[in-house]
Interface confidence: medium
Amino acid sequence: EVTLLDSRSVQGELGWIASPLEGGWEEVSIMDEKNTPIRTYQVCNVMEPSQNNWLRTDWITREGAQRVYIEIKFTLRDCNSLPGVMGTCKETFNLYYYESDNDKERFIRENQFVKIDTIAADESFTQVDIGDRIMKLNTEIRDVGPLSKKGFYLAFQDVGACIALVSVRVFYKKA
């Protein structure tokens, strides 16, 4: 495997683009059991209907790979654990990509992104010790291809869930 992006290995802030700029996805640093900061993106607007919060990564080079794999580690709160929000709370988010030769796209319209999948929390999860609490970490892998341009952007659409993206890794498999 060749890693193209690993959010856990980025030094400092990830600085991905959130839309809207406020009130949607927020970058939050948490500490793991070794007191090492983990950069996460979180959103939890479970009381308001019609949420449409987007988060997009920086440009990711494909390095000639035809097909890439996206591994997402995330937590997603069960709506039953959030009192009084059953009408508005969701338990999924959407994953998109946009191919581009431009590594500095300033603005990408929502309708330019291609949907990869709707992601839901699996029944299986890994328990991770984060300081004084246990975090239930889901892992989902999706693939996309064939790719033709020099690189691409990933985007995450929240539609009203209580979610934290803990790790995003993009890789391809060597032949």
Epitope: G23, S29, I30, R77, C162
Partner: nanobody
Framework: QVQLQESGGGVVQAGGSLRLSCAAS????????MGWFRQAPGTKREMIAA???????NYANPVKGRFTISRDDAKNMVYLQMNNLKPEDSAVYYC????????????WGPGTQVTVSS
């Protein structure tokens, strides 16, 4: 250990106002959205207001336009300004963190009783 202490409740006539306060300690609550919840006798606890780290607010429909949530991270405090109170607002009011990372709801403060008389 997370500790939450709500205060500011009381008895008030319909149409009156109250300001609830919540003191949070034992965790960096500035890292989380915070919410106010309430529970009337014989009903489930419901979330009525939330404020994100950035200060964005969300409200449940029954309190929208009447209640205002705010936070002061320097003091680790969360507030709920309640105006134009109605008898159906009578309940015990609680605050808590709203985190996607884990379920905070094994920690609850004692709450503060709000009674609205008609």
């Amino acid at each position: 250990q997370v500790q939450l202490q709500e205060s500011g409740g009381g008895v008030v006539q319909a149409g009156g106002s109250l300001r609830l306060s919540c003191a949070a300690s034992g965790r960096a609550f500035s890292s989380y959205a915070m919410g106010w919840f309430r529970q009337a006798p014989g009903t489930k606890r419901e979330m009525i207001a939330a404020v994100t780290r950035a200060g964005t607010t969300n409200y449940a429909n029954p309190v929208k336009g009447r209640f205002t949530i705010s936070r002061d991270d320097a003091k680790n405090m969360v507030y709920l300004q309640m105006n134009n109170l109605k008898p159906e607002d009578s309940a015990v009011y609680y605050c808590n963190a709203i985190s996607p990372l884990w379920d905070e709801y094994d920690f609850w403060g004692p709450g503060t009783q709000v009674t609205v008389s008609s």
